[in-house]
């Protein structure tokens, strides 16, 4: 039975040109993490394999950095980066756990909601 839960950084609103860290944490299970995949929509961004270490997809090499930990750092954000990101934990013997984070990249720090708009 899968008893674990994924905790994420939570959804993030960030400015164009900035950088953010996406992180997930698997808890409440003794299962061994064999690999963590980071995906956006249907695109693979990066893999962290317990034996082989990190692999960043070639198309994201310039803007994606591994870590901290099993997390992922996205740099030089563009509006096109807005979307849902998935951390997919492959574990033994439990199977697969998935966390979801929505990243919203905004053109400007002054939103139409008002001046006290919060961004990281």
């Amino acid at each position: 039975m899968m008893t674990g839960t994924i905790e994420t950084t939570g959804n993030i609103s960030a400015e164009k040109g900035g950088s953010i860290i996406l992180q997930c944490h698997l808890s409440s299970t003794t299962a061994q993490v064999t690999q963590v995949n980071w995906e956006q929509q249907d695109q693979l961004l990066a893999i962290c394999n317990a034996d082989l270490g990190w692999h960043i997809s070639p198309s994201f090499k310039d803007r994606v950095a591994p870590g901290p930990g099993l997390g992922l750092t996205l740099q030089s954000l563009t509006v096109n980066d807005t979307g849902e990101y998935f951390c997919i934990y492959h574990t033994y013997p439990d199977g697969t756990y998935t966390g979801r984070i929505f990243l919203e990249v905004l053109e400007s720090s002054v939103a139409e909601h008002g001046a006290r708009f919060q961004i990281p």
């Epitope: 950084t9 959804n11 979307g83 919203e104 139409e112 909601h113």
Partner: antibody, heavy 117, light 112 residues
Framework: EVQLQQSGPELVKPGVSMKMSCKAS????????MSWVKQSHGKSLEWIGL????????SYNQKFKDKATLTVDKSSTTAYMELLSLTSEDSAVYYC??????????WGQGTSVTVSS | DVVVTQTPLSLPVSFGDQVSISCRSS???????????LSWYLHKPGQSPQLLIY???NRFSGVPDRFSGSGSGTDFTLKISTIKPEDLGMYYC?????????FGGGTKLEIK
């Protein structure tokens, strides 16, 4: 002035699919995501999902992943939601709402869907 | 999914009253950058919902200052001072910090 104009009420038979629209005006369509919300009679609001008009990216509430399909047409600044294989459980008012910073600031007037044979 | 619990379900009021509506979440709504995406909406009969408060305490444009939001972590409050006839309706809180976004069950503000 920001406006979201939704298509009119629908009476549909069980098992069929239907597509509703949400025409946006008064702002830059691709600068905001568009959320869709369901309200069944006498119940709370439910977030169905959102679409990013800039790149077509979609985030679904898993509960609605096999029920709703979200699309946009940038040229006409219109968002669409198709509801699949309708049942009586899908009878509700559906709202589109402009969203930014994970809140919904402007809402359409709602599209009422009644599923009945 | 994050469960959002609103209390009370019904709130009978008289015009001029001050009232509070509570919204509690099953986990913290602060993200890793310290931002909390908790908003409040008023849904009047025959109308569309309208945004009152976003980011815990920020009033949306045009919203009277008799509406105020507060809270942190898992506990949030909407306060309305000096209730007016146009304030009657269903109030909902929404958490947008975690996927999927989830609404509270609603609080009906009605005349005693």
């Amino acid at each position: 002035e920001v406006q979201l104009q939704q298509s009119g009420p629908e009476l549909v038979k069980p098992g069929v699919s239907m597509k509703m629209s949400c025409k946006a005006s008064g702002y830059s369509f691709t600068a905001y995501t568009m959320s869709w919300v369901k309200q069944s009679h006498g119940k709370s609001l439910e977030w169905i999902g959102l679409i990013n008009p800039y790149n077509g990216g979609i985030s679904y509430n898993q509960k609605f992943k096999d029920k709703a399909t979200l699309t946009v047409d940038k040229s006409s600044t219109t968002a669409y939601m198709e509801l699949l294989s309708l049942t009586s459980e899908d009878s509700a008012v559906y709202y589109c709402a402009r969203s930014r910073t994970f809140a919904m600031d402007y809402w359409g007037q709602g599209t009422s869907v009644t599923v009945s044979s | 999914d994050v469960v959002v619990t609103q209390t009370p379900l019904s709130l009978p009021v008289s015009f001029g009253d001050q009232v509070s509506i509570s919204c509690r979440s099953s986990q913290s709504l602060a993200n890793s950058y310290g931002n909390t995406y908790l908003s409040w909406y008023l849904h009047k009969p025959g109308q569309s919902p309208q945004l009152l408060i976003y980011g815990i305490s920020n009033r949306f444009s045009g919203v009277p200052d008799r509406f105020s939001g507060s809270g942190s972590g898992t506990d949030f409050t909407l306060k309305i001072s000096t209730i007016k006839p146009e304030d009657l309706g269903m109030y909902y809180c929404l958490q947008g910090t975690h996927q999927p976004w989830t609404f509270g069950g609603g609080t009906k503000l009605e005349i005693k």
